[in-house]
């Protein structure tokens, strides 16, 4: 069953997924679907990574850690009811059926009325952007020379809500880790 | 317009070994999967195998993929599938298809296909 | 492997009458389905993808609906070209597997 993420209508979400590059630079393709994974590739493509970069994103989705070290966890920028369901990272190894495939449970809460507004830390601006590019057709990608040896890491649930970028950070540095491979 | 014209289908004996080649035309070969499907004769389809756009990611039928192997050459415009240990229950029209492709979608159903190929396995 | 299962296996029909084929999934794809049609001793042509997607070129009288583990193929009024066989095929879990197929045949 899915792994679940809690987010409220307003708030950023972030969806973690990981893998380890064998060695800097050497990047796998990832992909982020708006439901569960398919046979291939993602549904309902979000975002995009090649073996450089990330070469599409669509509006309010995009990547806050480095993705060059394997960090590929999506943020969704100030999420709705309608963005509840079941997204899809996709991290795809070479090799035959070598794809690693994970589906995880976005809810969305209605907002809480509080009495007095509260400050949040920005979260855009704990984590910058950090895409370059925006493909516009099919993307074209290099042959690397060996195929990496790669180790995943898909983070466990350690809370059901984010509430700022201090956990997020916390979060992604945590020991709590499953090893996948 | 899009084209795919597969070759070199025939009778070959059980045990036997054939390639398959798909030739593409009509769009950009590399920004697409590939895929094998195939047909016995009066039978329902069948996957067999695909791959993707840069051949460095390949998915088998689980019972075929210790004989059979997809390929292909973006230079060259082609797909080819290579059987071994051909048997009769291999007999089939094998077809090419291409994975139905644009960014926000993903590649599992096929928006052109082949003609087809017969592979004949019989003694 | 995800079981797809068809029904009728085969239909006959007349021109301009309604015809539904239905596609049962051994377990949930959501809406990870495609259907074609195919003329004998011709290829598959795709119709509609994911469940209810018309594909290009496609006429509108065909309509596919359906998710989860159920799903139809509807032709709201038969033309002669339309008798042919009619297969459904999942893409949400390897490997990709395709019904057993439907006959469309003209009464």
């Known amino acids: 069953s899915e792994v679940e993420y809690r987010a409220e209508v307003g708030q950023n979400a972030y969806l973690p997924c990981f893998y380890t590059p064998a060695a800097p630079g050497n990047l796998v393709p990832v992909c982020w679907g708006k439901g569960a994974c398919p046979v291939f590739e993602c549904g309902n493509v979000v975002l995009r990574t090649d073996e450089r970069d990330v070469n599409y994103w669509t509006s309010r989705y995009w990547l806050n850690g480095d993705f060059r070290k394997g960090d590929v966890s999506l943020t969704i920028e100030n999420v709705t009811l309608a963005d509840s369901g079941i997204y899809c990272c996709r991290i795809q190894i070479p090799g035959i059926m070598n794809d690693e495939k994970f589906n995880l449970k976005l809810v969305i809460k209605p907002a809480k009325v509080t009495p007095a507004p509260t400050r949040q830390r920005d979260f855009t601006a704990a984590f910058p952007r950090m895409l370059t590019t925006r493909g516009h057709g099919p993307a074209e990608t290099q042959t690397l020379g060996s195929l990496p040896d790669i180790n995943l890491t898909q983070i466990s649930t350690l809370a059901n809500e984010l509430r700022d970028s201090r956990l997020a950070n916390d979060l992604r540095d945590s020991g709590a880790t499953i090893r996948i491979g | 317009e899009v084209q795919l014209v597969e070759s070199g289908g025939g009778l070959v004996k059980p045990g036997g070994s054939l390639r398959l080649s798909c030739a593409a035309s009509?769009?950009?070969?590399?920004?697409?999967?590939m895929t094998w499907v195939r047909q016995a004769p009066g039978k329902g389809l069948e996957w067999v195998a695909s791959i993707n756009y840069d051949g460095r990611n390949t998915y088998y039928l689980d019972s075929l993929k210790s004989r059979f192997t997809i390929s292909r050459d973006n230079a060259k415009n082609s797909l080819y599938l290579q059987m071994n240990s051909l048997r009769a229950e291999d007999t089939a029209v094998y077809y090419c298809a291409r994975g139905y492709y644009y960014y926000g979608s993903s590649p599992n159903y096929f928006d052109y296909w082949g003609q087809g190929t017969l592979v004949t396995v019989s003694s | 492997d995800i079981q797809m299962t068809q029904s009728p296996s085969s239909l006959s029909a007349s021109v301009g009458d309604r015809v539904t084929i239905t596609c049962r999934a051994s377990e949930n794809i959501y809406s990870y389905l495609t259907w074609y049609q195919q003329k004998p001793g011709k290829s598959p042509k795709l119709l509609v993808y994911?469940?209810?997607t018309l594909a290009e070129g496609v006429p509108s009288r065909f309509s596919g609906s359906g998710s989860g583990t159920q799903f139809s193929l509807t032709i709201s009024s038969l033309q002669p070209e339309d008798f042919a066989n009619y297969y459904c095929q999942q893409h949400y879990g390897t490997p990709l597997t395709f019904g057993q197929g439907t006959k469309l045949e003209i009464k």
């Open positions: 009509g769009f950009t070969f590399s920004d697409y999967y």
């Open positions: 994911n469940a209810k």
